[in-house]
């Protein structure tokens, strides 16, 4: 057993060396080790084949070190590895795309708070067993096409707290089992209409605290299992362009946050969901360049770079081109709400608004989710009063789900040392 470590055999063969000031992976780790704990040291480099002898290794914790470089072959031979925690290594910045190849049993990968600026092509190739992927609180600016294509069993994808500016068409291809997608606290301004095409099992989507002024309802259409949606803290433009989203939200039976309008000024701060259809008229034009919303339609429908509903009548150009002018009736949505997007009848009455971190709680929906934020940060715009919680229960043996974002009773005790529920 290495000098700075403690080694024991029961209940799992373990080499434990946390917070020992180690500057390198120690030599002499017992080959029979099933768990290796090296967190909280000063390790800056993981050389090739560092753990090659440890064929039975299932858990490797290297979090909270000063890793700056991981050789591409660092984890060679670890065919049984299930948990790999590399988080809290802010100097890492990049990972060779071959680093995780061969880890066919890996189901939990922590890469959060690693200063990652990009995800190299093929980084997650072959990780067919992966269920939990932590990429939050990095410096990612883009989601390359097909990055997660091989992750057919992934259920939790954490991407919040990055610098992602758009969600392209192929970003989430292959994620057929995804249950929770956390994209909050990024810079997302555009979501491609087909970005969520493969996410038929998605139950939780967090897009709050981004730069969204609109969201194509075509993107939401494939989300048949969606229960929890958070869209607050975005600069929503509540004009004719918001009509489809408004209609979709009226029909959504899950739990959703408020969708506070930024523009037009007369609707600033109002919740899109609580507006009437005829509030969404005209085109609010912000100062500065207009950023077109991806619609998937031919550009000849948008000759001015504006959605069709914003194309001015000849006598009404000023209301489009001059910010601050009131919208005229002639600039309302031409025709009616698009087919299939008509609002429901008034049978259910107004929805109950819960606190913004939790969202709207319609009577038929499961209880809403809690807010999740990077550690130590304060939430944006938390309310100071208002309805908050339901009466208590005594379901005393519910096990928490892996990240405690799931539905009631969704978690299980887990087996072995697996991190999933």
């Amino acid at each position: 057993c290495p000098g700075a470590c403690v080694c024991y055999n029961e209940p799992k063969v373990t080499t434990s060396c946390p917070q020992q000031g180690l500057q390198a992976v120690p030599v002499g780790i017992p080959a029979a080790s099933q768990r290796i704990f090296l967190h909280g040291n000063r390790i800056s480099h993981v050389p090739a084949a560092s753990f090659r002898a440890c064929r039975n290794l299932t858990i490797l914790w290297l979090h909270s070190n000063v890793l700056a470089r991981i050789d591409a072959a660092a984890f060679t031979g670890l065919a049984l590895l299930e948990q790999l925690d590399l988080s809290d290594n802010a100097q890492l910045r990049s990972v060779d795309p071959a680093t995780f190849h061969g880890l066919g049993r890996l189901h939990t990968l922590h890469l959060d708070r690693c200063g990652l600026q990009e995800l190299g092509p093929g980084l997650f190739r072959g990780l067919a067993a992966l269920q939990y992927l932590y990429l939050q609180d990095n410096a990612l600016q883009a989601l390359p096409d097909d990055t997660f294509r091989d992750l057919g069993n992934l259920t939790h994808l954490f991407l919040h707290g990055n610098r992602i500016s758009s969600v392209p068409e192929r970003a989430f291809r292959g994620l057929h089992s995804l249950d929770r997608l956390l994209l909050h606290q990024n810079r997302v301004a555009h979501v491609h209409p087909h970005a969520f095409r493969d996410l038929g099992r998605l139950m939780t989507l967090y897009l709050f605290a981004n730069n969204l002024s609109a969201l194509p309802t075509e993107a939401l259409a494939p989300l048949r299992a969606l229960q929890y949606l958070r869209l607050n803290d975005n600069p929503w433009v509540c004009d004719c362009r918001a009509r489809p989203l408004w209609a979709w939200l009226q029909k959504f039976r899950g739990s959703s946050s408020e969708v506070p309008c930024s523009l037009p000024q007369r609707l600033a701060g109002r919740d899109l969901k609580r507006l009437a259809a005829n509030d969404l008229q005209g085109c609010a034009v912000a100062t500065g360049p207009y950023h077109p919303i991806w619609t998937g339609r031919a550009t000849d429908e948008e000759p001015l770079g504006l959605p069709k509903c914003c194309q001015p009548d000849a006598a009404d150009k000023a209301s489009v081109l001059e910010p601050g002018r009131p919208a005229s009736a002639g600039n309302a949505l031409k025709g009616r709400v698009p087919p299939g997007d008509s609002p429901p009848g008034n049978g259910s009455g107004p929805r109950h608004i819960n606190d913004s971190p939790f969202g709207t709680l319609p009577g038929s929906a499961e209880p809403p989710l809690t807010a999740v934020r990077p550690e130590g940060s304060e939430p944006p715009g938390f309310p100071t009063s208002g309805p908050r919680r339901r009466p208590g229960c005594s379901r005393k043996n519910r096990t928490r789900s892996h990240c405690r974002l799931g539905q009631a009773g969704s978690g299980g005790g887990g087996t072995g040392d697996s991190e999933g529920s």
Partner: antibody
Framework: QMQLVQSGAEVKKPGASVKVSCKVS????????IHWVRQAPGKGLEWMGG????????VYAQKFQGRVTLTDDTSTDTAYMELSSLRSEDTAVYYC??????????????????WGRGTMITVSS | DIQMTQSPSSVSASVGDRVTITCRAS??????LAWYQQKPGKAPKLLIY???RLQSGVPLRFSGSGSGTDFTLTINSLQPEDSATYYC?????????FGQGTRLEIK
């Protein structure tokens, strides 16, 4: 700096009820998950109940079910724990505590990171 | 309910020593375990969460490890101010349960 400020010590008779307050300062209660833990003299820590942020509901330990009620007043940022039908064995220090997990990122690590100073409740005839 | 069992129930050690306290869960709790330090007349203080994550402001001589059912809290180079009672707590499900505590005394 967030703090949890609890109400003062009380002496109660058996069969009575007591209501302990826990005021949040430096934050808003609606953004927190507050739990209650008690400690009898010379004994260990015992979890009584708290806000389960996953299910958006208050959960109680079975031992206290029906006797304890956890409420809050978000207008004053104050959480309350009321324990009824007091017995001598309820003599203890009662703590409120914030669940760290409510603030963490996707990992959702739970633990009680900020505690009140405790409120001594003595049950004696 | 998940039972948490700590050992030893008390330990006496000298300044500079290395002390290890173990906590065993009656069923698999993955890595969802926290460690607290409590001094007489004071509220508990969080040391470690998620088995191995050091809470902000806690000295580096404290470390935690383990997963599944067995966990350890290690204090390297014991200091006089470490005299206290230490508790583990599972955070895997409700009800949250604590170990019975380990009293650490400085010789």
């Amino acid at each position: 700096q967030m703090q949890l400020v609890q109400s003062g010590a009380e002496v109660k008779k058996p069969g009575a009820s007591v209501k302990v307050s826990c005021k949040v300062s430096g934050y808003t209660l609606s953004g927190l998950s507050i739990h209650w833990v008690r400690q009898a003299p010379g004994k260990g820590l015992e979890w009584m109940g708290g806000f389960d942020s996953e299910d958006d509901e208050t959960v109680y330990a079975q031992k206290f079910q029906g006797r304890v009620t956890l409420t809050d007043d978000t207008s004053t940022d104050t959480a309350y724990m009321e324990l009824s039908s007091l017995r001598s064995e309820d003599t203890a220090v009662y703590y409120c505590a914030r669940d760290l997990g409510y603030l963490t990122s996707g990992n959702y690590y739970d633990a009680f990171d900020i505690w009140g100073r405790g409120t001594m409740i003595t049950v004696s005839s | 309910d998940i039972q948490m069992t700590q050992s030893p129930s008390s330990v006496s050690a000298s300044v500079g020593d290395r002390v290890t306290i173990t906590c065993r869960a009656s069923q698999d709790i993955n890595r969802w375990l926290a460690w607290y330090q409590q001094k007489p007349g004071k509220a508990p203080k969080l040391l470690i969460y998620a088995a191995s994550r050091l809470q902000s402001g806690v000295p580096l001589r404290f470390s935690g490890s383990g997963s599944g059912t067995d966990f350890t809290l290690t204090i390297n180079s014991l200091q006089p101010e470490d005299s206290a009672t230490y508790y583990c707590q599972q955070t895997n499900n409700f009800p949250r349960t604590f170990g019975q505590g380990t009293r650490l005394e400085i010789k």
